[in-house]
Amino acid sequence: KSSWGLENEALIVRCPQRGRSTYPVEWYYSDTNESIPTQKRNRIFVSRDRLKFLPARVEDSGIYACVIRSPNLNKTGYLNVTIHKKPPSCNIPDYLMYSTVRGSDKNFKITCPTIDLYNWTAPVQWFKNCKALQEPRFRAHRSYLFIDNVTHDDEGDYTCQFTHAENGTNYIVTATRSFTVEEKGFSMFPVITNPPYNHTMEVEIGKPASIACSACFGKGSHFLADVLWQINKTVVGNFGEARIQEEEGRNESSSNDMDCLTSVLRITGVTEKDLSLEYDCLALNLHGMIRHTIRLRRK
């Protein structure tokens, strides 16, 4: 497991192995096997399953081992700690970023990463792309930043800054994560928009005919969505009539802010026999399926 921090800030890391809170945990410098003390007067010391760097230095970077001593088994975890110098500019490099949060709600909250490991007191200060957030739309509450009326303009890198208190001394901690805005999707039972239910279409014998089947499924969440044709309850490809073909692929479109699919049935030259067939437009997705049956009649 990897952890990182910034020079001259507090860094607290937790043993990657988990055990009962009553089990003793010992920490070591992995390369020297030297034990790390528990006395708080040291700059680096152990507190139960946590290793504290107060403050951290670049030279603290390295691999640390923690051993959880339980009655029947010792479990060892390894932690790769990297302490970086503060970036000189506002561009935060990827290696200092915590996981990206994706917002789709109109009102969204961003959590300050790792804050639960620290002895912090409110308020937490928040910055976006290094600028302090002062608009009333941005509200800091506990370890969260609430953003009201989220828009794509709110995308960017958000940094939280708070104070860790230990033995009467305060230490700064900062953490940054990206925020991206996603359109809120919704999925619904398919709706066939064309052809209408029990529709009859006029065709000319000997002439080509095309029938479009269009259905909508919601916005951005059309799982297992498909639109297809059947002839007399048989998939077109298995019907055995070369003159009648379903177009390859599905045309995607939007209608009234919904995602829709269209499949086209082509008849190269309509015959009398075609007038006696049933043509079914089927739309299906995760929620279920629906069919509209149409017939052909001579113009």
């Epitope: 297992l224 995760l286 279920g288 399926m289």
Partner: antibody, heavy 116, light 107 residues
């Protein structure tokens, strides 16, 4: 309470036909897809196909297309999986499951053994 | 069809340890992924749906994450009853497919 109850274990000879069932209760049977899943001895789960009982529309996995037939009788809230001619390689546990953004309810499974 | 590859095939851990199971899709399935647990002689049981939503009655130690092609099921601290086989399954596009499974066994 939503339940899917499957028919009992079957022992058949190669070449014989078989139809196993899955009865749904506690929900609107015609409004949810019912899928069939095969698990051969000591192996993983394989999706075979699915039916929408409200319309009896079926969709098969390419591996099972033409090998089995899925059907439903909505009047008795029951879905079926059938073989016209069993092979020894059809020996497996077969599960039915309701699909609603995931297979949220499963039948207890029907063990089919095909042996001469 | 979309192929789901689970790793590792077997995970040997002790009770109390953290289990991390991976499921990789051959193409994006967005967040249309579910995780199931199966114990010997039992039907599979739904744990997680839409990549990160816990099913009704599933303990908080089970969590799912990921979207697109890479997904993770995490069991924060293994209980004796968690030793089983775990499957991922996608329902983004037809045909629906399952991963080959990861067996979590007692070390």
């Amino acid at each position: 309470e939503v339940q899917l109850v499957q028919s009992g274990a079957e022992v058949k000879k190669p070449g014989e036909s078989l139809k196993i069932s899955c009865k749904g209760s506690g929900y609107s049977f015609t409004s949810y897809w019912i899928g069939w899943v095969r698990q051969m001895p000591g192996k993983g789960l394989e999706w075979m196909g699915i039916i929408y009982p409200g319309d009896s529309y079926t969709r098969y996995s390419p591996s099972f297309q033409g090998q089995v037939t899925i059907s439903a009788d909505k009047s008795i809230s029951t879905a079926y999986l059938q073989w016209s001619s069993l092979k020894a390689s059809d020996t497996a546990m077969y599960y039915c499951a309701r699909l609603s953004g995931r297979f949220d309810y499963w039948g207890q499974g029907t063990l089919v053994t095909v042996s001469s | 069809e979309i192929v789901l590859t689970q790793s590792p095939a077997t995970l040997s851990l002790s009770p109390g340890e953290r289990a991390t199971l991976s499921c990789r899709a051959s193409q994006s399935v967005r967040d249309a992924l579910a995780w199931y647990q199966q114990k010997p002689g039992q039907a599979p049981r739904l744990l997680i749906y839409f990549a990160s939503n816990r099913a009704t009655g599933i303990p908080a130690r089970f969590s799912g994450s990921g979207s697109g092609t890479d997904f993770t099921l995490t069991i924060s601290s293994l209980e004796p009853e968690d030793f089983a086989v775990y499957y991922c399954q996608q329902f983004n596009t037809w045909p629906i497919t399952f991963g080959q499974g990861t067996k979590v066994e007692i070390k």
